[in-house]
Every structure is written in C-alpha cells, then in structure tokens.
C-alpha cells in the first residue's frame, strides 16, 4: 500500500496567490484529516471529513481556507488568497 499521497511535496508562491494542496487517502479509509504544523503554533487540525462529508472545519475559521472531498479517493485544501503566515507543513491523514 502506498499510504496517503499528497501533492505537491513543496510549494512556493507569492502572497495573494491561490494555493491548492491535494490528497489521496488510503483506499478503504472513510475519514480524512487536514493538519497544519508550524514552529509557532504547533500542530493544528484544520478540517476532517467522514464519508466525504465535512464534520468539523473549526480549525480553519478564515474563509481564505476551503476544503473539498468530492469522492472517497480525493480531497483538496485551497488557500485564496495566501498570506506569508500560511507558510507551514500541511499534512493529510486518513483512517478507517
């Protein structure tokens, strides 16, 4: 099993531009989670889906952030417009 697959691995963008992160969860997993990690703020849960439905998006109250899961094998996290403080490592995770 390839595990959770994210793309891109690295992203550099200018402030104000749109950024889209993609995730392919492990096949058969019905829950998907997006996290953000920075030195200053630690690990933050942004949103999680269960059976493609967003259950809790309270980790991303800024409407610059949006996430979708159109089907069981794909999710996107979009930032529009991006800001310097969005610089972070973004993790996608999945579970049964």
């Amino acid at each position: 099993d390839a595990g959770v697959i994210q793309s891109p691995r690295h992203e550099v963008t200018e402030m104000g531009q749109e950024v889209t992160l993609r995730c392919k969860p492990i096949s058969g997993h019905n829950s998907l989670f997006w996290y953000r990690q920075t030195m200053m703020r630690g690990l933050e849960l942004l949103i999680y889906f269960n059976n493609n439905v967003p259950i809790d998006d309270s980790g991303m109250p800024e409407d610059r952030f949006s996430a979708k899961m159109p089907n069981a094998s794909f999710s996107t996290l979009k930032i529009q417009p991006s800001e310097p403080r969005d610089s972070a490592v973004y993790f996608c995770a999945s579970s049964l």
Epitope: S58, P61, Q80
Partner: antibody
Framework: EVQLVESGGGLVQPGGSLRLSCAAS????????MHWVRQAPGKGLEWVSY????????YYADTLKGRFTISRDNSKNTLYLQMNSLRAEDTAVYYC??????????WGQGTTVTVSS | DNQLTQSPSFLSASVGDRVTITCRAS?????IYWYQQKPGKAPKLLIY???NLAPGVPSRFSGSGSGNEYTLTISSLQPEDFATYYC?????????FGQGTKLEIK
C-alpha cells in the same frame, strides 16, 4: 434549541483578573468553534478571540494578546475567557458566539465587565 | 489588520423606504457577513457569505458585493428594522467589524 449563557462578569479593579464562562447547550459543542466578542458602552462590536473545537487553533485580537486566554472544556460544554491585567478600557459587555455559516450564528445574552477603582 | 468602514454611520429613513448600507474593506475580502443589533440585545446574524440570508431573516434583506466593497439593502423598511447594523470579515484574522450603521426613524 441553541443556548449560550455567559457568566462571570462583575466589577474588578484595574490590574485585576476575571474569568468569564459560557455554558452551551442545544448543539454539538465538541465539534464547534467558538468566539468571544465585546462591546464597550455606547460603542461598536470588537472581536476578541476564537478557539476551534479541539483547542488546536486559537486566534486573538492583536491588542489583547498576552492578557486574555481563551479555553474550553468539551466535557462540560463550556467556553472560558481568562482576563488578566485588566484596564478601564476593557469595560464592556462580553458575548460568546457560536461559529456557524462561516460567521457567528448564535450569540449569548452577554455578561458585563466593569474595570474601575 | 483589515479595516472595515461602513457608510453612512447614521441613517434616518421612513417605513417603506429602500435603504442601502455600504461596507468598504481596506484589503480585499472573500465575503462579508452582516449583523443586526437592537438596544440592550445581542447581535443577530442577518447575512452570511455576502448574499445568503440567515434562517428566519425576511427576504426584504439582501446582500451583495465583492473585493473591497459590499452592500446590505433593505427593500422596504419595516418598524422592526430600526437598529444598528454591522459588517464583519472572516477572510483573515483578526476578524474585524465595521464601526456600525445606526438606522433611525425619520
């Protein structure tokens, strides 16, 4: 029916501390983000702080960072605001509000904080 | 911080009038949200995501706009609409409010 009930307000001297509480009912508190907003007498609304469902994401108004601390206890369905080093300009009605529709869709009735010697 | 400026700050109007309140942002925002507050009461959400009416809000209220400029329109004022209205942005923390528009009976 969604209900938010604030408590803990009162009269406090400058430099003092106060902890506000907001008891929530009628919705799944444990997966809902929550805000504090305040309103000084005769003034407009001022956003204070936000906390996500699991407390991993927290934001504060720049002017209040370091003095105010937002927290929550999901087992008690309660939101808190710890306010330290209080100043006269912190005198206001403090509201808790639920995050919903991308905004604040339900509000409590407010609790009054007066900072005066 | 993104500063929101509402105009006018005060507005006198009569029952049946059509009124428009403007909210201008110092930096572009994705959406604007509108609240109504009556004296001694908590604010009430009117419009979310720029143009969506919150549950129970009459259809005489509408919202529009994009970028830096947004509007709240009341098509035919009713006695219960006399209140103070606030805009707010959630595009970027801190989640600033406009200074408010007080709508009074002429």
């Amino acid at each position: 029916e969604v209900q938010l009930v604030e408590s803990g307000g009162g009269l406090v001297q400058p430099g003092g501390s106060l902890r506000l509480s907001c008891a929530a009912s009628g919705f799944t508190f444990s997966n809902t983000g929550m805000h504090w907003v305040r309103q000084a007498p005769g003034k407009g609304l001022e956003w204070v702080s936000y906390i996500s469902s699991g407390s991993s994401t927290i934001y504060y108004a720049d002017t209040l960072k370091g003095r105010f601390t937002i927290s929550r206890d999901n087992s008690k369905n309660t939101l808190y605001l710890q306010m330290n080093s209080l100043r006269a300009e912190d005198t206001a009605v403090y509201y808790c509000a639920r995050r919903g529709e991308g905004a604040m869709d339900y509000w409590g009735q407010g609790t009054t904080v007066t900072v005066s010697s | 911080d993104n500063q929101l400026t509402q105009s006018p700050s005060f507005l006198s109007a009569s029952v049946g009038d059509r009124v428009t309140i403007t909210c201008r942002a110092s930096s572009s925002v994705n959406y604007i949200y509108w609240y109504q507050q009556k004296p001694g009461k908590a604010p009430k959400l009117l419009i979310y995501y720029t143009s969506n009416l919150a549950p129970g809000v009459p259809s005489r209220f509408s919202g529009s706009g994009s970028g830096n400029e947004y509007t709240l329109t009341i098509s035919s004022l009713q006695p219960e609409d006399f209140a103070t209205y606030y805009c707010q942005q959630f595009t970027s923390s801190p989640f600033t409010f406009g200074q408010g528009t007080k709508l009074e009976i002429k």
